[in-house]
């Protein structure tokens, strides 16, 4: 699986999850998030050669098409597969609220 | 929606579904598919600016991060959203078989 366990331990050029730390204030301008100050959102990148963690029949077909027609601009793309939530603290007026934001952390990638 | 109805009628630079005809023999080397000879598989391409058909909270965050940090390599990617099956005819020995291959035709795209 192209997950953090594999990708963070290997120098992988092809599609894999990469570490990306995002600071809510500095990187997004989100002053409303009080805790945490930032988090590892991570991201997916790298080429998708034929059959590499293909998401659907279409991505398999497109990967093969791209292999046999290397000049073509059509190829699968490395995108998030498994995502996890992030717990944040924000305020409504002067009342603190703890809430879970879904799909905030990329744990693995796929070729789609 | 970034679907064939919209994308095929507009000159859209950003993420959209694009027409792509694939000939089974010539483009894939698949001699086993007798009918159809080829089909419009289509593909997704184009930049994913902030908030464009964002798939998850993560792609929204990443789009904003990319807008505010344009030198960053992390950005959402334009990939298939809705896919449709394709019915094909092939032979097992001299026996014709009609089968539906799932997720073969891209009908719309998203930024993931």
């Amino acid at each position: 699986a192209l997950d953090t366990n594999y990708c963070f331990r290997n120098l992988e050029e092809n599609c894999c999850v990469r570490p990306l730390y995002i600071d809510f204030r500095q990187d997004l301008g989100w002053k409303w998030v009080h805790e945490p100050k930032g988090y590892y959102a991570n991201f997916c990148s790298g080429p998708c050669p034929y059959l590499r963690s293909a998401d659907t029949t279409h991505s398999t077909v497109l990967g093969l098409y791209n292999t046999l027609n290397p000049e073509a601009s059509a190829s699968p793309c490395c995108v998030p597969q498994d995502l996890e939530p992030l717990t944040i603290l924000y305020y409504v007026g002067r009342t603190p609220k703890v809430e879970q934001l879904s799909n905030m952390v990329v744990k693995s990638c796929k070729c789609s | 929606a970034l679907d064939t109805n919209y994308c095929f009628r507009n000159l859209e630079e950003n993420c959209c579904v694009r027409p792509l005809y694939i000939d089974f023999r010539q483009d894939l080397g698949w001699k086993w598919v007798h009918e159809p000879k080829g089909y419009y598989a289509n593909f997704c391409s184009g930049p994913c600016p902030y908030l464009r058909s964002a798939d998850t909270t993560h792609s929204t965050v990443l789009g904003l991060y990319n807008t505010l940090n344009p030198e960053a390599s992390a950005s959402p990617c334009c990939v298939p959203q809705d896919l449709e099956p394709l019915t094909i005819l092939y032979y097992v020995g001299r026996t014709p078989k009609v089968e539906q291959l799932s997720n073969m035709v891209v009908k719309s795209c998203k930024c993931s």
Partner: nanobody, 118 residues
Framework: EVQLVESGGGLVQPGGSLRLSCAAS????????ASWYRQAPGKERELVAT????????HYADSVKGRFAISRDNAKNTVFLQMDSLKSEDTAVYYC???????????WGQGTQVTVSS
């Protein structure tokens, strides 16, 4: 088995103090947001105090600011709530909550009754 066990509740006079404890077991407590909530009869459960790992600032509901103090001991997998200058309106069932910062996992304690009355 995952467990959050609260203790330290009871009956106290107005102006008095109590110290609530919440012992966590079965998970890595240091990865979790630790919070205290309370629910008074006929009212919604409200957040009283919370602290994010590893060293996030404590945050408090307006009604308890300056009187209550949350602290955690990650080595002992425990979170505390020191409650001073207690008022009758602090009467409620107090619940300990642990929520993973990144990923799934939300756990609740069974609750401990705090009654402030003369």
């Amino acid at each position: 088995e995952v467990q959050l066990v609260e203790s330290g509740g009871g009956l106290v006079q107005p102006g008095g103090s109590l110290r609530l404890s919440c012992a966590a077991s079965g998970f890595t407590f240091s990865y979790y947001v630790a919070s205290w909530y309370r629910q008074a009869p006929g009212k919604e459960r409200e957040l009283v105090a919370t602290t994010f790992p590893p060293d996030g600032s404590p945050h408090y509901a307006d009604s308890v600011k300056g009187r209550f103090a949350i602290s955690r001991d990650n080595a002992k997998n425990t979170v505390f709530l020191q409650m001073d200058s207690l008022k009758s309106e602090d009467t409620a069932v107090y619940y300990c909550n642990a929520r993973r910062v990144e990923g799934h996992g939300i756990y609740w304690g069974q609750g401990t009754q705090v009654t402030v009355s003369s």
